[in-house]
């Protein structure tokens, strides 16, 4: 009975992201078979959170758009470990929108989940931010520094990395 | 007043190379992006691609790369666009734009004939 | 690619006809749809974006709907100067493509 009623809450919280991700790619968390983390297939995953790199090129308004539509936002950059992991799966010669603006081009970047903006875990190029006109924040590869961020205006069609928290069931 | 202004019309043989300019003037240059949209006689609108003026950073329509190629002098306030390897479908009107603050393509230059014919 | 296909190609209609076209995407374009009249030998104008803003100068007989992939052009009241070729385009993602445009002629 007790089973059967978690089979059922799965099956309801399934339904829920149907919408958006008719498939799921499930892992058993610990050795308890009853916690299952999920992402939508083809995402992959990392710690608690899933990633996708959309190819389509967008502005970052519509990007975050694309992001949101699938239950995700521009991926925030916590820490060097999630850059590292991410990169692995971008191209060199592309960039990708962050999740960071400057809405107001007075150089106070602002995550879009509200996390807030720490200078102490950021990765910029060398030199950059430096253009006030340039408010928004992408991930892309320079052959001197590897990858890193740059400030880049927010209507220059670029690909994307969305995130979203991993899916329990 | 924002205007964007364009370079007279070209002749040109096929295979040879085009090289339009868009001169704007009446706001801040490096601010907004730069579109170019064509049109062969007497059929619709084809985006190209962008460039930013302030970066240079460029975006192009894929059935155009490799042929296209927008660059920009900032001494001038003036954006070009090259095409190269013409043919006589790319006879046409070309048209440079400037994108907006609300994404949309708010002020057109006049416009630019290239004939291509040998 | 997201595909743009305005209907119809061409209409006749007299002074004082409320006059529509339409415009599909061949996927959710969200609302990020312009509209442009386009008379002969000049360049396009900005008509509306968002698919129902009108943009400035612009009068108020010009009116957008619609959302997804269908979208809606309506001129209220079909003025002597509205005689001209309508264009939808696409703002959603690269590339940023037309409609194929609507002529609309005098009856």
């Known amino acids: 009975n007790f089973m059967y009623s978690k089979t059922v809450k799965r099956l309801s919280k399934l339904r829920e992201y149907q919408q958006y991700h008719p498939s799921l790619t499930c892992v058993m968390e610990g050795k308890d078979i009853e916690d299952w983390s999920c992402c939508p297939t083809p995402w992959t995953s990392f710690q608690s959170s899933c990633y996708f790199i959309s190819t389509g090129m967008q502005s970052w308004t519509k990007s975050q758009k694309n992001c949101s539509v699938m239950g995700a936002d521009l991926v925030v950059i916590n820490t060097r470990e999630e850059q590292d992991f991410i990169i692995q799966n971008l191209k060199r010669n592309s960039s990708y929108f962050l999740g960071l603006s400057d809405p107001g081009g007075r150089r106070h970047w602002q995550w879009v989940d509200q996390t807030p903006y720490n200078e102490n875990v950021t990765f910029w190029h060398s030199g950059e931010p430096n253009n006030l006109d340039e408010r928004c924040a992408i991930i892309n590869f320079r052959s001197s520094e590897e990858w890193g961020w740059n400030d880049i205006h927010c209507h220059v069609p670029q690909k994307s990395i969305c995130k979203m928290k991993k899916i329990y069931i | 007043q924002v205007q964007l202004v364009q370079s007279g019309a070209e002749v040109k043989k096929p295979g040879a190379s085009v090289k339009v300019s868009c001169k704007a003037s009446g706001y801040t240059f490096t601010s907004y992006l730069i579109h170019w949209v064509r049109q062969a006689p007497g059929q619709g609108l084809e985006w190209m691609g962008t460039i930013y003026p302030g970066g240079g950073d460029t975006s192009y329509n894929q059935k155009f790369k490799g042929r296209v190629t927008m660059t920009r002098d900032t001494s001038t306030s003036t954006v070009y666009m090259e095409l190269s390897s013409l043919r006589s479908e790319d006879t046409a009107v070309y048209y440079c734009?400037?994108?907006?603050?609300?994404?949309?393509?708010?002020?057109w230059g006049q416009g630019t004939l290239v004939t291509v014919s040998s | 690619d997201i595909q743009m296909t305005q209907s119809p190609s061409s209409l006749s209609a007299s002074v004082g006809d409320r006059v529509t076209i339409t415009c599909r995407a061949s996927?959710?374009?969200?609302?990020?749809l312009a509209w442009y009249q386009q008379k002969p030998g000049k360049a396009p104008k900005l008509l509306l974006y968002d698919a129902e803003t009108l943009a400035i100068g612009v009068p108020s007989r010009f009116s957008g709907s619609g959302s997804g992939t269908d979208y809606t052009l309506t001129i209220s009241s079909l003025q002597p100067e509205d005689f001209a070729t309508y264009y939808c385009?696409?703002?959603?993602?690269?590339?940023?493509?037309f409609g194929g445009g609507t002529k609309v002629e005098i009856k």
């Open positions: 734009a400037r994108m907006g603050d609300n994404e949309y393509f708010d002020y």
């Open positions: 996927g959710n374009i969200h609302n990020y």
């Open positions: 385009q696409h703002f959603w993602s690269t590339p940023y493509t």
